[in-house]
Each structure stands twice: as structure tokens, then as C-alpha cells.
Interface confidence: medium
């Protein structure tokens, strides 16, 4: 069958019909519907929303919509024993206590079940001690403290500002430094953009606003009690002591009003430089402990949260493909929120809902996609990407054989300045071509393409006239599909101007103030940016599911592999003497990249010329494209991170949100000058070069002529 037998309309008209059916007003309506009450993972409210979405997707016309449930480890505050932090005097009396919850936003005063700010999966504990300010608690911040300033965090409670890196990495770093507790806070320098008012008068964080979030270091494991396998009815669960990624010290988040009270008394060392100073009217002294008059006062944490195995629900919708039903294109985003989820995740869920509605409308008119499209509403993303990971673990054999692509659909907006795309290089050309066909929603770009406004506002640092596309890291539901299973993945959303807004994420991220009104009043009153994101995400899914030849260009992988090889080589060349001493050579890697480039070029030529009416040859060529991403998977995984198996990309070991290229080599080289056994350390570098070179060569060979 050719793809036109799947439909009674021409392919070009299909895409136009699909895009024309997407309506901003519907996205707005869906967002409102999804944000009126909290939908915390594991709660009845989120189960009810799952059933509502299941019902609506069926109404929209999907072939089947099922709930997939798992029993996973979640974490909740104790309702009768709230978490807080105190300053205590020498008699042990609490002379200051942090806020027990955020003051509710106007109109939401009587909403029940707003979970107070907490760090999910924090152990219980009531440590008390001197405070040390550790800036962002990054690896380099602890290097500065311990190596340059000779400040010992052992037995101290550290206070770190949110931003720059994933909070779980901060906690891991604090644990490794010997801290006995961690206080996380939002500094106005990072979460209060100059010239903008705080909510409800603007989109900035008020002093009482607090960022919730998990503090796990799962490294792709999913449910901490069932790593590698689904948390189903007959699962064998680890004991809590053997659980993956749980923090070992109490952690709690606060807002900047409370942080002011803790930081204003700090004594000890002055901040090492201006990069350690935020925007509060405090000295940003590092400590340890309080200054002069307050030196006998200590900080005490009171953490009483509990970890509980709880049922979660994914919604999985299927639109069966007419020609290749055994090839899956997946569009997935999460449904669970910390509170109202005005941006995260419901701005994404509302877009997915409208995409499903549009596909359903076409299906009701007699159309079907060439390939099967799976739609997913994931649960428990906020607790460690649990819903998506458990489902992928349960369906891994199908996915690794049939998975064409995964498009992620969390928050549609984190700003309203320009498009932001992170994806596999295989999708670069798809994204470029699609955005050239879409209209820009940006002011000053009326009648211009999205590609044009995006390129102007976010130019590629390497290629002139092209937009920036970033590497995939983690911190979202594509992780298991890309990093573990090697399924080509991508994500798109509207973002802020990173040049002028240096704060981390958006100010109200994971706070109670992330409401429908935040989006409707301040970010996207016309919902035009949401519509554009729907067109990009939906358009990518449409092309991936419907184009006769998969819209992947393997030559773009060749280009980035060369760039990444150059980068890792230059990092290694900072140690020329050791490279000589230990005979470290990158020749094998550069040779493999050269081979990949030549083979990819020849494959692309064959792709232009082959007989597309021959279904066997077509399927063969498409399979080579589909399985290319899979070829970068090392079944043994990265050192100490068995579920990060992609050799070209992994989440940074220092920041889960960021992607690192050739992560095995990068980690082997990191801080190598401080290793006690240099011979062993450089031996590991050589081993990682070998693994990378072999993998690139093996991937290249999957693109060679089959016989």
C-alpha cells in the first residue's frame, strides 16, 4: 500500500487540514478545565482527571484509550505534622519559623488539598547546626568552598539557591560534602525579573512563593523500588534502604522572605566573588554559622514527610496506522502537577488535548495516518518521570522494535519570546522544514515564517541563518525513550529571551501561583504561542506518522558527531603531558566519525533514488532510519548509570537538565587532575574512547547497503 491508500485526501492537504483544525480558543478552554484544582500524582483528583481525559479522547475519535496503572514510591508531607525550619537560641527555643505554606492566590483561598511546599523524597529528620551558604550548590561551588576557601560542610546545614542545575544534583553534592541538611531557596536574582511585579500583579515570584520539586538522583531508573522493571501487581520491590536515588539527608524549600531571615545573620567568610551574591539585602556570607551577636543561634530543620507506595495512572490513546500499524509515533506529556499546573504541565496537556481532537476530527472524516500514533498522558512525572518510565519498562520490547519517534509535550511555554527546540539531530531537518511552513506569532514578524522569527531571535551559534537547536538532557518524560531505549526524540516550547532574562526557568515554576490566570493575563492572553507550539508538536507528529519516507536526515548526525569529537578532544588536550604518558589517542573516534559521515552521505543519496513504490525496499530504508538512533545504545549503559545507555548523549552528571555529548569520555576526563590514581583514570578515558569509537562505527554500518 502507498500512503495515499490510507486516506481519501492528498498528503499535503492532510497536514493543512490537521493544522487548520487546531484552535487557540480550544487550548484556552482546555487549560482552564485542567487547572481549577490541584492534580497531584497519586491523588483522587488526578485519577478523576485521567478518567476525564480517557473519556474525551474516546469522544474525539481515537481507536482505543486505556488507563495503565502502576504502584510506585511517592512522597507527601505529613498533614498533621508540618515541615518547617527554625532559628533556635542557646536554650533551644524557636525564635523564628519559616512559613508552613504559601499564601493562596486571589480566588483560590478556599481550594482544598494544596500540598504545602516540600522537597519530595526528603527523609525525615530534625538536624540542627550551623548554616553554610553554598551558592547554587553546583560541583564548582563545592570545589570553591572546599578547595579554595577551605570551608568544611561536614555536619553543617547548607543553604543553596535554586537555579542553574537540577535540584537533585544540588542535594547529591551537599551529601557528598558531608552536609546533614539542605535548605533550598529562590533568590530574587534568579526568580524575580527586574521591572515586573510579583503575582497577582505580574509574573514574578512573591516573597512567600516557594518552588516544590523532587530531589531524587534516579539516573533514569523510574520507580525507586523497581528499577528496570514495571511496578505492576506482581512486582518484587526493593527495601527502602536499597531504593534507587533517595536522598539521605533532610531537604526543604523556602521563599525569599524566609531566606532573608536566615541569610541576614550569616557570619564567617565573605562571598568569594560577586557571582555568589544574589539580590537580597544580605551580605551573602558563606559562614559557617551566624555572626557575632547571633553566634549562639543555630538552624533546625523539622521534616516529617513520608514515602508511600501509591497507585498512578497513565492514559494511553491509540490511533491505528493504516499502512504500518506496527510503527509507533508517540506524543506524550504529563498530567500530574504540584498544585494547579497553570504552566507545568497543563499548558502542555491542553495542547496535546487539542492535537488529539484535531487528529480525531480527520479520522472521523475517513483519514488515517500511515503509522500508528500513540498519545500519552503521563502520571507522576514530578516524582521522577515515573509514569512514562514504568510504561516504557512494561512495553520496552515493543518500543525497541516499533518505536519511530517520541515527541514530548510538557509545558508549552516558559516565556513568550521565541521557539525553543531540543531534539535528536535526526529531526533537525524536519523541524527546519516544518517551521518554514508555519506562521510566526511574534510581534514584528507578521506574515513571516516561524523559522524566520526563531532564527532572528535565537540564532545557531555555529551555522549562520539557522536557529539554535539544543541537545536533549533530561528532567522530562522523553528520558526513558531517548536515553534508555534509543528512540528518536524531540521537544518544543515557547521560551523567554535568555539574553535579557537570566533567571532560572520561569519565576513561578512549581509554586501555588502557577495558575490559569498567570497564563491568561501575563504570558499568552490570545493563546497564540500555545497554538504555535501545538502546530510544531502536532506537525512533527503528523510528518513522522504520515510521510512515506521517514523525515530523518542522518547527515545531520554526522555533522554533530564531528563537532562533539572535536569538543571532547580539546578537553582532553588540556592535559597534553598525560595524553603522551598514557598513550591516549582519539584516532579511532575520528576515524569512526569520518566513516559515519561517508556512509551517511551515501545512504542519503540512495534515499533520493530508490523505488518508493516497492514496499519492501521502502520499509527496509525506513527501518535503517528508525534503527539509527537505536544503534547508539550501549546495552551495558554508562558507568554507574545503567539506564543511561545512549553513547552520544546523556544527562550531565552535574546537572540532570543539561545534555552532555560523549558523556562516557566527558565524565572520565572530569576533574581528572585530582584523581588519586592517574594511571587508572587515564585508562578509563581510553576505554571510553574505545566504546564511543566502536559505537559510532557500528551505527555507521547500520546505514551501509544491506547486502
Amino acid at each position: 500500500k502507498s500512503s495515499n491508500e490510507a486516506t481519501n485526501i492528498t498528503p499535503k492537504h492532510n497536514m493543512k487540514a490537521f493544522l487548520d483544525e487546531l484552535k487557540a480558543e480550544n487550548i484556552k478552554k482546555f487549560l482552564y478545565n485542567f487547572t481549577q484544582i490541584p492534580h497531584l500524582a497519586g491523588t483522587e483528583q488526578n485519577f478523576q482527571l485521567a478518567k476525564q481525559i480517557q473519556s474525551q479522547w474516546k469522544e474525539f475519535g481515537l481507536d482505543s484509550v486505556e488507563l495503565a496503572h502502576y504502584d510506585v514510591l511517592l512522597s507527601y508531607p505529613n498533614k498533621t505534622h508540618p515541615n518547617y525550619i527554625s532559628i533556635i537560641n542557646e536554650d533551644g527555643n524557636e525564635i523564628f519559623n519559616t512559613s508552613l505554606f504559601e499564601p493562596p492566590p486571589p480566588g483560590y483561598e478556599n481550594v482544598s488539598d494544596i500540598v504545602p511546599p516540600f522537597s519530595a523524597f526528603s527523609p525525615q529528620g530534625m538536624p540542627e547546626g550551623d548554616l553554610v551558604y553554598v551558592n547554587y550548590a553546583r560541583t564548582e561551588d563545592f570545589f570553591k568552598l572546599e578547595r579554595d576557601m577551605k570551608i568544611n560542610c561536614s555536619g553543617k546545614i547548607v543553604i543553596a539557591r535554586y537555579g542553574k542545575v537540577f535540584r537533585g544534583n544540588k542535594v547529591k553534592n551537599a551529601q557528598l560534602a558531608g552536609a546533614k541538611g539542605v535548605i533550598l531557596y529562590s533568590d530574587p536574582a534568579d526568580y524575580f525579573a527586574p521591572g515586573v511585579k510579583s503575582y497577582p500583579d505580574g509574573w514574578n515570584l512573591p516573597g512567600g512563593g516557594v518552588q516544590r520539586g523532587n530531589i531524587l538522583n534516579l539516573n533514569g531508573a523510574g520507580d525507586p523500588l523497581t528499577p528496570g522493571y514495571p511496578a505492576n501487581e506482581y512486582a518484587y520491590r526493593r527495601g527502602i534502604a536499597e531504593a534507587v536515588g533517595l536522598p539521605s539527608i533532610p531537604v526543604h524549600p523556602i521563599g525569599y522572605y524566609d531566606a532573608q531571615k536566615l541569610l541576614e545573620k550569616m557570619g564567617g567568610s565573605a562571598p568569594p566573588d560577586s557571582s555568589w551574591r544574589g539580590s537580597l539585602k544580605v551580605p551573602y556570607n558563606v559562614g559557617p554559622g551566624f555572626t557575632g551577636n547571633f553566634s549562639t543561634q543555630k538552624v533546625k530543620m523539622h521534616i516529617h514527610s513520608t514515602n508511600e507506595v501509591t497507585r498512578i495512572y497513565n492514559v494511553i490513546g491509540t490511533l491505528r496506522g493504516a499502512v504500518e500499524p506496527d510503527r509507533y509515533v508517540i506524543l506524550g506529556g504529563h498530567r500530574d502537577s504540584w498544585v494547579f499546573g497553570g504552566i507545568d504541565p497543563q499548558s502542555g496537556a491542553a495542547v496535546v488535548h487539542e492535537i488529539v481532537r484535531s487528529f480525531g476530527t480527520l479520522k472521523k472524516e475517513g483519514w488515517r495516518p500511515r503509522r500508528t500514533i500513540l498519545f500519552a498522558s503521563w502520571d507522576a512525572e514530578e516524582f521522577g518521570l515515573l509514569g512514562s518510565t514504568e510504561w516504557a519498562e512494561e512495553n520496552s520490547r515493543l518500543l525497541q522494535e516499533r518505536g519511530v519517534a517520541y515527541i514530548n509535550a510538557d509545558s508549552s511555554i516558559e516565556g513568550n519570546y521565541t521557539l525553543r527546540v531540543d531534539c535528536t539531530p535526526l529531526m533537525y531537518s524536519l523541524v527546519h522544514n516544518l517551521t518554514k511552513e508555519l506562521k510566526s506569532p511574534d510581534e514584528g514578524f507578521e506574515g513571516k515564517s516561524l523559522y524566520e522569527s526563531w532564527t532572528k531571535k535565537s540564532p545557531s551559534p555555529e551555522f549562520s541563518g539557522m536557529p539554535r537547536i539544543s541537545k536533549l538532557g533530561s528532567g522530562n518524560d522523553f528520558e526513558v525513550f531517548f536515553q534508555r531505549l534509543g528512540i528518536a526524540s524531540g521537544r518544543a516550547r515557547y521560551t523567554k529571551n535568555w539574553e535579557t532574562n537570566k533567571f532560572s526557568g520561569y519565576p513561578l515554576y512549581h509554586s501555588v501561583y502557577e495558575t490559569y490566570e498567570l497564563v491568561e493575563k501575563f504570558y499568552d492572553p490570545m493563546f497564540k504561542y500555545h497554538l504555535t507550539v501545538a502546530q510544531v508538536r502536532g506537525g512533527m507528529v503528523f510528518e513522522l506518522a504520515n510521510s512515506i519516507v521517514l523525515p530523518f536526515d542522518c547527515r545531520d548526525y554526522a555533522v554533530v558527531l564531528r563537532k562533539y569529537a572535536d569538543k571532547i578532544y580539546s578537553i582532553s588536550m588540556k592535559h597534553p603531558q598525560e595524553m603522551k604518558t598514557y598513550s591516549v589517542s582519539f584516532d579511532s573516534l575520528f576515524s569512526a566519525v569520518k566513516n559515519f559521515t561517508e556512509i551517511a552521505s551515501k545512504f542519503s543519496e540512495r534515499l533520493q533514488d530508490f523505488d518508493k513504490s516497492n514496499p519492501i525496499v521502502l520499509r527496509m530504508m525506513n527501518d535503517q532510519l528508525m534503527f539509527l538512533e537505536r544503534a547508539f545504545i550501549d546495552p551495558l549503559g554508562l558507568p554507574d548509570r545503567p539506564f543511561y545507555r545512549h553513547v552520544i548523549y546523556a544527562p550531565s552528571s552535574h546537572n540532570k537538565y543539561a545534555g552532555e555529548s560523549f558523556p562516557g569520555i566527558y565524565d572520565a576526563l572530569f576533574d581528572i587532575e585530582s584523581k588519586v590514581d592517574p594511571s587508572k583514570a587515564w585508562g578509563e578515558v581510553k576505554r571510553q574512547i574505545y566504546v564511543a569509537a566502536f559505537t559510532v562505527q557500528a551505527a555507521a554500518e547500520t546505514l551501509s547497503e544491506v547486502a
Partner: antibody
């Protein structure tokens, strides 16, 4: 020194109007919500109205909404309360107060008050 | 609107005695705030967010409570503590104060 100074109080007949002013000094006026709170003779405190940073949002005691208007002029570091159709029960000391935050509603700085007497 | 009821309305206490003032809300509130007012003076912020003492407030004062029931406690009353104390909620508009508790020194 952080200071709030009210003015504009006095004796007015029922049905009359009065405009109270509050001059702020010693802090960045535009960074704070502001409020009026009143206290009838021998009685307790009663919140009258709040205004956000730039005056775009105002909040009133329901029973006063139609007669009282809170406003501000950030350029002049001034807060105002326009009171129309005054009644005997509006007789009180009117305090201008700084609201530390739009949520916590913690009135951390108060003026000395200005007396309004409504009597024929 | 949320009604705050203080008890007692009036209390006459001897120095060094422990004093508790109750504030009951007609529906649950996030936090309670307390102010002290002396005759012919403006109110002064005294306790914010239920349990935190405003700047300059002696440590013999403390605040506690949650939901609908809140308490201001003076551990060992001193003469300078004679005043009227008001509780206030900011959970929802309209903002409301309690009717006040007048503390007199015997």
C-alpha cells in the same frame, strides 16, 4: 527613616466628601502594596482598602466600595483615600499602613493617623 | 467574610503572670497576625505569620496555632505589656481584625 504621614482629616457634614493623603518616605514606595485602616472612637481596628504596587488593583471592604476610592501616585510617593457621601458611622481615626507583601498582609509600618469626624 | 473572635475582651493580670489571648476564626486561615496598640498610639506589628516576632518584640511573647484557633502568649507579663492586642487575618478579602483584647496590669 521609614515614615508615613497622613493628612486631610477634619470635620465634615453627613453627605460631604473628604480626601485623605498619606506621604511616604524612607523606602521605595512603588515596591509595596498600601492600605487604609480605620478605628472608630473606643472601637477596634477595621480594614478599609488595599491597593497594589501601581494602582491597577484595588480591594475594599464591601460596605464602602461604592463610596470610597483608594489611589496612589508613585511619582509623589503618596497614597490617597477619596471618601464621598460620608456618614456618621465613618467617624474614625484613619491610618495609612504599608503592606509588607500583597499576600502576607502584614502591616509593618503605620502612620500616626488622621481624624475624620462626620457630624452636622 | 472571615470573622475573628478574640477572648477574653478584657484581662487584668499581675506582673510575672503567664497570659494567653485566643483568636478564633469562623473558617480556616493560613496564618494569624497580631498587633499591639497603646492608648493614643498607632498599632504596632507584634507577631507575623502566626509565630514570628516582629522586630523589637521581647522574647517573652510567642504565637501559635493553625486552622481556626490561634493564641498569643506572654510568658511573664511586664508592666510595659499593658495594651490592646488585635489579631488579623489576610487569608482572603476582606481583611478582618478581631475585636481586640485589652490587657491591664493589676
Amino acid at each position: 527613616e521609614v515614615q508615613l504621614v497622613e493628612s486631610g482629616g477634619g470635620l465634615v457634614q453627613p453627605g460631604g466628601s473628604l480626601r485623605l493623603s498619606c506621604a511616604a518616605s524612607g523606602f521605595t514606595f512603588s515596591d509595596y502594596y498600601m492600605a487604609w485602616v480605620r478605628q472608630a472612637p473606643g472601637k477596634g481596628l477595621e480594614w478599609v482598602a488595599n491597593i497594589n504596587y501601581d494602582g491597577s488593583s484595588t480591594y475594599y471592604l464591601d460596605s464602602l466600595k461604592s463610596r470610597f476610592t483608594i489611589s496612589r501616585d508613585n511619582a509623589k510617593n503618596s497614597l490617597y483615600l477619596q471618601m464621598n457621601s460620608l456618614r456618621a458611622e465613618d467617624t474614625a481615626v484613619y491610618y495609612c499602613a504599608r503592606d509588607l507583601d500583597g499576600y502576607y498582609g502584614y502591616f509593618d509600618v503605620w502612620g500616626q493617623g488622621t481624624t475624620v469626624t462626620v457630624s452636622s | 467574610q472571615i470573622v475573628l473572635t478574640q477572648s477574653p475582651d478584657f484581662q487584668s493580670v499581675t506582673p510575672k503572670e503567664k497570659v494567653t489571648i485566643q483568636c478564633s476564626a469562623s473558617s480556616s486561615v493560613s496564618y494569624m497576625y497580631w498587633y499591639q496598640q497603646k492608648p493614643d498610639q498607632s498599632p504596632k506589628p507584634w507577631i507575623y505569620r502566626t509565630s514570628n516576632l516582629a522586630s523589637g518584640v521581647p522574647s517573652r511573647f510567642s504565637g501559635s496555632g493553625s486552622g481556626t484557633d490561634y493564641t498569643l502568649t506572654i510568658n511573664s507579663l511586664e508592666a510595659e505589656d499593658a495594651a490592646t492586642y488585635y489579631c488579623q487575618q489576610y487569608h482572603s478579602y476582606p481583611l478582618t481584625f478581631g475585636q481586640g483584647t485589652k490587657l491591664e496590669i493589676k
